[in-house]
Amino acid sequence: EYSNCGENEYYNQTTGLCQECPPCGPGEEPYLSCGYGTKDEDYGCVPCPAEKFSKGGYQICRRHKDCEGFFRATVLTPGDMENDAECGPCLPGYYMLENRPRNIYGMVCYSCLLAPPNTKECVG
């Protein structure tokens, strides 16, 4: 009977029905497991740890974008428990390739040492 329930559902013994696992709120992630018919007795939601965020539901908390360290960009908006960080323009000494599709992270800045002549962010 349990296996008839979906990914985020548990089998409710009282009603004999599949029931939605309680979704977490923004800034929280599931603690222990719930789904496919079973629910851990102590299943619940816990706040995201530092430097991570979640939009809620059944998502685990994810690390904020590292604008400066990974993307070599300025921080437009720092992340909090509910929102990812937003990156701004490239750091000094870095530039963004024009007319290039953004990757899954949105943007990456490249060192001016590799820039073509007259790249505006690298002039001067």
Epitope: N4, E9, Y11, Q13, T14, T15, L17
Partner: antibody, heavy 118, light 108 residues
Framework: QVQLKQSGPGLVQPSQSLSITCTVS????????VHWIRQSPGKGLEWLGV???????DYNAAFISRLSISKDNSKSQVFFKMNSLQADDTAIYYC????????????WGQGTLVTVSA | EIVLTQSPTTMAASPGEKITITCSAS???????LHWYQQKPGFSPKPLIY???NLASGVPARFSGSGSGTSYSLTIGTMEAEDVATYYC?????????FGSGTKLEIK
């Protein structure tokens, strides 16, 4: 096949109680819940409560103080009782049930038109 | 409680026309818990679509359902005279179970 048949009075005096019986066939009351829903004249559908297969109940908070749902599994009967009826309780009262692991109203009784009037 | 808002409240359509009725929930509902019913005057409601997109037994294939989250819809691919009725959405996610206020479909 699955059937739900309702029996109960059509006329109830103000402040009196309403009793309706829903007799089911084609499934076991020990396995499935039976819901009660009403529809006031010209209005929409209002969920009142449910008795689950295991015998526990859930009620709409607006009716919890005057509503009681019980059952007799061996007779395949569910009993609905609402106290202290007033004119605005005039409605068609339905029992309904489901099958499978999700709670949708796959089967409905024929409805009992209840008029609250002196 | 979860409030379901249906639109439009009433509508008239010509035979052969495509009809869409929407149901908006006040909070997120998993698609497994949203259902649709058809009611004709003098009759009990009849199950139409369960779990968002599954046709109940005997329901013509011109009916379909879709949606997720807080936004769901019922579509009649080509309106027929026998489709004149009131349509209700319903959620089975939480207690109390709730219904939309209904959409009355008439024929032009």
């Amino acid at each position: 096949q699955v059937q739900l048949k309702q029996s109960g009075p059509g006329l109830v005096q103000p402040s009196q109680s309403l009793s309706i019986t829903c007799t089911v066939s084609g499934f076991s009351l020990s396995n499935y819940g039976v819901h009660w829903i009403r529809q006031s004249p010209g209005k929409g559908l209002e969920w009142l409560g449910v008795i689950w297969g295991g015998g526990s109940t859930d009620y709409n908070a607006a009716f919890i103080s005057r509503l009681s749902i019980s059952k007799d599994n061996s007779k395949s009967q569910v009993f609905f009782k609402m106290n202290s009826l007033q004119a605005d309780d005039t409605a068609i009262y339905y029992c309904a049930s489901y099958y499978g692991y999700y709670d949708w109203f796959a089967y409905w009784g024929q409805g009992t038109l209840v008029t609250v009037s002196a | 409680e979860i409030v379901l808002t249906q639109s439009p409240t009433t509508m008239a359509a010509s035979p052969g026309e495509k009809i869409t009725i929407t149901c908006s929930a006040s909070s997120i509902i998993s698609s497994n818990y949203l259902h649709w019913y058809q009611q004709k005057p003098g009759f009990s409601p009849k199950p139409l679509i369960y779990r968002t997109s599954n046709l109940a037994s005997g329901v013509p294939a011109r009916f379909s359902g879709s949606g997720s989250g807080t936004s769901y819809s019922l579509t009649i691919g080509t309106m027929e005279a026998e489709d004149v009725a009131t349509y209700y959405c319903q959620q089975g996610s939480s207690i109390p179970r709730t219904f939309g206020s209904g959409t009355k479909l008439e024929i032009k």
